[in-house]
Amino acid sequence: LRLLDHRALVCSQPGLNCTVKNSTCLDDSWIHPRNLTPSSPKDLQIQLHFAHTQQGDLFPVAHIEWTLQTDASILYLEGAELSVLQLNTNERLCVRFEFLSKLRHHHRRWRFTFSHFVVDPDQEYEVTVHHLPKPIPDGDPNHQSKNFLVPDCEHARMKVTTPCMSSGSLWDPNITVETLEAHQLRVSFTLWNESTHYQILLTSFPHMENHSCFEHMHHIPAPRPEEFHQRSNVTLTLRNLKGCCRHQVQIQPFFSSCLNDCLRHSATVSCPEMPDTPEPIPDYMPLW
């Protein structure tokens, strides 16, 4: 987790002087509780936005927006703590809005936004906005939390972000798989414009099962420049196992920008359709 660029971040708006500060996620009001504390944020919304860095790179960011409740507690509102928690790693990043002037009621509801938390493709977050000072122990909570899901690199807008492009999102291998005679599969895919090797991972399954009955790995050496964007054809030999008929072919590239963590593409061959009525078994065995 990080902030988009480290240029001066602003939270000021007409009628409010405000500055954005880095935060340890442990506001002083936890340690030194105040008697009078503001109410919680209202209508917290988290949306996926996209923003460019000063270098021109495009990143997905969490756009955080909330409003204030129209009660007298805004007189005691000194700021807000914004926290983004990556759910599985438990990594947390916080910033603090510090109000340098007192809030006053005005003709429209106070609204705040922040769009500088960079988020990762295909990850899950909890976003919390805490009004400051935080409540006394056992006081009514004055925060709001929402879960937030970032789409993976197959999502149209995500595909062109820097982290997705770095993991090979623009490569479309257009995989085709055909079943040949003699228990073989012909796999064909389009090479990318990089001299890097690929791996084909074949996993076979019985018709209605999810436990594999055959696995095979095939290495494809790095193509020469004249082969870039050309089709690569590989014939894989299957194990002759009755009913081991559903095949998943996965192609793993090893691009320099993502090494062994590049996006993989896959294609599946289904089992052949079973005839509705089984063919009659002859009651005699021919000798020829």
Partner: antibody, heavy 116, light 107 residues
Framework: QVQLVQSGAEVKKPGASVKVSCKAS????????ISWVRQAPGQGLEWMGW????????NYAKKFKGRVTMTTDTSTSTAYMELRSLRSDDTAVYYC?????????WGQGTLVTVSS | DIQMTQSPSSLSASVGDRVTITCRAS??????LNWYQQKPGKAPKLLIY???NLQSGVPSRFSGSGSGTDFTLTISSLQPEDFATYYC?????????FGQGIKVEIK
């Protein structure tokens, strides 16, 4: 190929405990959390909670707090869900699933029958 | 906790039909909604995440739409393998909650 393989069916007496395992393969274990969802016979899906495979942190549904414990074993890429003080209405198929918010791969389910 | 209500409770349709299933949240979940398909004796399968994103490997005849409190799962042309129970699930607020499910049956 991402796979979550759960332990076999269990029959338990009321008041007993059950521990269901969920072994993952085909992806980087610590990248995604593991969630647990149950389904009583003929009923819908009920979220029980989740565990971080990275930190071990847990988040349980209120209904199960104090009765459920979720753990993981990183060395074997296995998650466990233990439910204590079993009652007859805990009879259900218990599923593990990958991730926290969008449950993209599921185990085959473990039927736990609670009967005296 | 947020209540998720699906309608209709069950529906009958024919192969090739366009089928629409709705899900309503008791309060706004913005786009924090997933759709799952479950066949008898099997685990659920994720179809749509974040209200409208198609999960990898899911046929393009499935689509999702909506935000706030009202959501729709559409199957553009029902196939024999689509007869199943469909669940919505919100993830914006803890605890995560599921709808009661809608069974799509053969007419």
């Amino acid at each position: 190929q991402v796979q979550l393989v759960q332990s076999g069916a269990e029959v338990k007496k009321p008041g007993a405990s059950v521990k269901v395992s969920c072994k993952a393969s085909g992806y980087a274990w610590t990248r995604y959390g593991i969630s647990w969802v149950r389904q009583a016979p003929g009923q819908g899906l009920e979220w029980m909670g989740w565990i971080s495979t990275y930190s071990g942190n847990t988040n349980y549904a209120k209904k199960f707090k104090g009765r459920v414990t979720m753990t993981t074993d990183t060395s074997t890429s296995t998650a466990y869900m233990e439910l204590r003080s079993l009652r007859s209405d805990d009879t259900a198929v218990y599923y593990c699933a990958r991730r926290v918010l969008r449950l993209d791969y599921w185990g085959q389910g473990t039927l736990v029958t609670v009967s005296s | 906790d947020i209540q998720m209500t699906q309608s209709p409770s069950s529906l009958s349709a024919s192969v090739g039909d366009r089928v629409t299933i709705t899900c309503r949240a008791s309060q706004s979940v913005h786009t924090g909604l997933n759709w799952y398909q479950q066949k008898p004796g099997k685990a659920p399968k994720l179809l749509i995440y974040g209200a409208s994103n198609l999960q990898s490997g899911v046929p393009s005849r499935f689509s999702g739409s909506g935000s706030g409190t009202d959501f729709t799962l559409t199957i553009s042309s029902l196939q024999p393998e689509d007869f199943a129970t469909y669940y919505c699930q919100q993830f914006e607020h803890n605890p995560l909650t599921f709808g009661q499910g809608i069974k799509v049956e053969i007419k």
